[in-house]
Amino acid sequence: AYRPSETLCGGELVDTLQFVCGDRGFYFSRPASRVSRRSRGIVEECCFRSCDLALLETYCATPAKSE
């Protein structure tokens, strides 16, 4: 189970992103429009530091707009 704040690396990070983002998919670097001063890429953020659910969700792709 995903723990609130931890280091996530390798396949565990990929699997966690797939779980959190579901059908939306995800980016390993945030798209330009969503870049913040902290945009180091998710491996850098989660593996070399630590990350929480909120941070993981910022790497999910934007859901397609429905009519």
């Epitope: 690396c9 390798g10 396949g11 565990e12 990070l13 990929v14 699997d15 180091r40 070399f48």
Partner: antibody, heavy 120, light 107 residues
Framework: QVQLVQSGAEVKKPGASVKVSCKAS????????MHWVRQAPGQGLEWMGI????????SYAQKFQGRVTMTRDTSTSTVYMELSRLRSDDTAVYYC?????????????WGQGTTVTVSS | DIQMTQSPSSLSASVGDRVTITCRAS??????LNWYQQKPGRAPDLLIN???SLQSGVPSRFSGSGSGTDFTLTISSLQPEDFATYFC?????????FGGGTKVEIK
């Protein structure tokens, strides 16, 4: 072609330090993480740590924490691994190896290895 | 840390034989398992990643399977150049860990 070229063999005394270099060519140096792996004579492979050549961030195996330092020089596309307080059981071949992607899919390009011998 | 246990540690086989090497993880690693081949005096070469994905240039006689904790490397028809040591490695979580190796020798 994609290549990692390591520095030459070293002979060190116990307690000394060694610094091994690994020069990358044939690809964008800052786009791939770099691992260091060692292999004692006749033994298996042991992962030591990883460096992000882009930002310089590192993560080390607990066993080497406090004794190993990994650095990089983007101007020469070179990563370095320094191991201090050497002991006889640090005698090994040290390899740098490029990560495939996202730290999830192995190491696809390896240096030729650097033999480090620790002996009094 | 995740422990990787390889078996057998060595085996003797003849050219043309089908060879199977197994690797077991101490906890589930999904499909994040890589296989390497190492010849004496050389660096390892990545053969297979993600449990079953053959690397470019690797002969199709090599195949990998498994997920969770149990994985297999199969050489369908052993060739003279395949006599080497094979290592598995998990890339599920840090620290990355390797199996102890399987040395494939000529019978």
């Amino acid at each position: 072609q994609v290549q990692l070229v390591q520095s030459g063999a070293e002979v060190k005394k116990p307690g000394a330090s060694v610094k091994v270099s690994c020069k990358a060519s044939g690809y964008t140096f800052t786009s791939y993480y770099m691992h260091w792996v060692r292999q004692a004579p006749g033994q298996g492979l042991e992962w030591m740590g990883i460096i992000n050549p882009s930002g310089g961030s590192t993560s080390y195996a607990q066993k080497f924490q406090g004794r190993v330092t990994m650095t990089r020089d983007t101007s020469t596309s070179t990563v370095y691994m320094e191991l201090s307080r050497l002991r006889s059981d640090d005698t090994a071949v040290y390899y740098c190896a490029r990560d495939v992607q996202w730290l999830a899919y192995g190491m696809d390009v390896w240096g030729q290895g650097t033999t480090v011998t620790v002996s009094s | 840390d995740i422990q990787m246990t390889q078996s057998p540690s060595s085996l003797s086989a003849s050219v043309g034989d089908r060879v199977t090497i197994t690797c077991r993880a101490s906890q589930s690693i999904s499909s994040y398992l890589n296989w390497y081949q190492q010849k004496p005096g050389r660096a390892p070469d990545l053969l297979i990643n993600a449990a079953s994905s053959l690397q470019s240039g690797v002969p199709s006689r090599f195949s990998g399977s498994g997920s969770g904790t149990d994985f297999t490397l199969t050489i369908s028809s052993l060739q003279p150049e395949d006599f080497a040591t094979y290592f598995c490695q998990q890339s599920y979580s840090l620290p990355f860990t390797f199996g102890g190796g399987t040395k494939v020798e000529i019978k």
